[in-house]
Interface confidence: medium
């Protein structure tokens, strides 16, 4: 374990003593705590404005949370020799607003990356692929956690936020080995249609607490390994036949649909029929109607076809204001 002037040797994490001498390979950076036995470095809530340069080569788990990094440039973690063991990198809540292409290059073992709670006004299309080639070298990432990375409205670029995130996820087909993707709490209005097709290994997809209105143009068909699909707390009104069939065809999936404003009219009939026979939806007995007003709080599983009607559309000449 690294030496320190202020901590006892029995402590699991030892704070670094600042030193003017050139860093040793396994010295602990200033303002960080290091444990070689746990292969962990924590530089947490220290208002760091850049990634420490003198990270120990043994680091496997790196926590850089609660800092003020602002920009993550290309090669932010590139070292000579490389941080070959670094497997889990947590940058959550570090006030990042820009992640540039190649920011995570030269991390051959990086399996988990958490960028949550950073207001990312700019996420390079090549943030995860590291290259602008049409097919990049596969990323080692297995888990990518991007919860609450939406910037405030006044910091958004002209292009859609959904499109910016999607471009980074599909670039160079680098994330074909991704097993977990968390995109909760990002105000997504839609899911770009080509994203999931480029992520065939997904086991766990969290899209909860967004503003998704429809899944009509989203295809889950090739996500044959998917185990958990979280769609709670969105703005879903109904799931149509195509989506229902795709979800039913996934061999291992569990779908979470709580707290969506389901519209219980004639368009809901197929979904209700499906809910009654499927084992795919977790907590399906909790799903209730939000609209129309006369159906509010009715349990979807308790509805029958007679309950699900649509008001006839009147010709314009007969409509009243």
């Amino acid at each position: 374990t690294s030496s320190a002037s202020s901590s006892s040797s029995s402590a699991p994490f030892l704070a670094s003593a600042a030193s003017a001498q050139p860093p040793l390979p396994d010295q602990c950076p200033a303002l960080c705590e290091c444990s070689e036995a746990a292969r962990t470095v924590k530089c947490v809530n220290r208002n760091l404005t850049e990634v420490p340069t003198d990270l120990p080569l043994y680091v496997r788990n790196l926590f850089l949370t609660g800092n003020q990094l602002a920009v993550l440039p290309a090669g932010a973690f590139a070292r000579r020799p490389p941080l070959a063991e670094l497997a889990a990198l947590n940058l959550s809540g570090s006030r990042l607003d820009e992640v540039r292409g190649g920011a995570f290059e030269h991390l051959p073992s990086l399996r988990q990356l958490d960028l949550s709670h950073n207001p990312l006004a700019y996420l390079s299309p090549f943030a995860f692929s590291g290259s602008n080639a049409s097919i990049s070298a596969p990323s080692p990432l297995v888990e990518l956690i991007l919860n609450h990375i939406v910037p405030p409205d006044d910091k958004r670029q002209n292009r859609s936020f959904e499109g910016m995130v999607a471009a980074a996820l599909v670039a160079g087909r680098a994330l074909q080995g991704l097993h977990l993707l968390e995109l909760a709490s990002n105000h997504f209005l839609y899911l770009p249609r080509d994203v999931l097709a480029q992520l065939p290994s997904l086991r766990y997809l969290d899209l909860s607490n967004n503003s998704l209105v429809s899944l009509t143009y989203v295809s889950f068909r090739n996500l044959t390994h998917l185990e958990s699909l979280h769609l709670e707390d969105n703005a879903l009104k109904v799931l149509h036949n195509g989506t229902l069939a795709e979800l039913q065809g996934l061999p291992h999936v569990r779908v979470f649909l709580d707290n969506n404003p389901w519209v219980c009219d004639c368009h809901m009939a197929d979904m209700v029929t499906w809910l009654k026979q499927t084992g795919v939806v977790q907590g399906k007995d909790r799903l209730t109607c939000a609209f129309p007003e006369k159906m509010r709080n009715r349990v979807l599983l308790e509805l029958n076809s007679a309950d699900l009607d649509c008001d006839p559309i009147l010709p314009p000449s007969l409509q009243t204001s």
Epitope: P12, S35, A87, R111, E143
Partner: antibody, heavy 122, light 110 residues
Framework: EVQLEESGGGLVKPGGSLRLSCAAS????????VGWVRQAPGKGLEWVSI???????YYANWAKGRFTISRDNSKNTLYLQMNSLRAEDTAVYYC????????????????WGRGTLVTVSS | DIQMTQSPSTLSASVGDRVTITCQAS??????LAWYQQKPGKAPKLLIY???TLESGVPSRFSGSGSGTEFTLTISSLQPDDFATYYC????????????FGQGTKVEIK
Amino acid sequence: EVQLEESGGGLVKPGGSLRLSCAASGIDLSHYVVGWVRQAPGKGLEWVSIIYGSGRTYYANWAKGRFTISRDNSKNTLYLQMNSLRAEDTAVYYCARDASVSVYYWGYFDLWGRGTLVTVSS
Amino acid sequence: DIQMTQSPSTLSASVGDRVTITCQASQSIGSELAWYQQKPGKAPKLLIYRASTLESGVPSRFSGSGSGTEFTLTISSLQPDDFATYYCQQGYTYSEIDNAFGQGTKVEIK
């Protein structure tokens, strides 16, 4: 020193229950995927259960419904509650830590306890 | 349900021999495979993860290879300390499985 130490094993009658504990020192267990692996006398390793940092749990098919994994982060301790025990559950039970932090998925154990022996016999 | 099958079950060898143990998965597990060494009365020790990455502190005479369904552990020159039982373990999924480990290969003195 980073280590895991199991306790709670012993002799129990068929149909009985037992709760195993695994206390961690030198690491914050809440950051890691941790689990249980067992080994019957003279037999091979058998995976039992894991719990992720997120609280998500997995069990071997044969353990579902009888075994429950849990953790107490304030005590830095992992537990395995075993109910309806059978003679074939006799084994050394190891607590093991996954090789890196993960909310969901990883896949190999780099730190093991010494094990605690559970004997199920009338 | 993914099953892991090791062969051989027992292997007799001499110091200095090159030893190869194979592990077969019943379906593709990519590179998500680990190898462990266990000595009597002791806990297992991680040797190799992600099919071919040597765990820190493990001698370089140990190596792993393979992907998909076929994997190999090789000891290039068997040392006295290497007589033990070796297990493979898939880390591809923990969902709906009976066991993540192979049944083991005992390497004994010839």
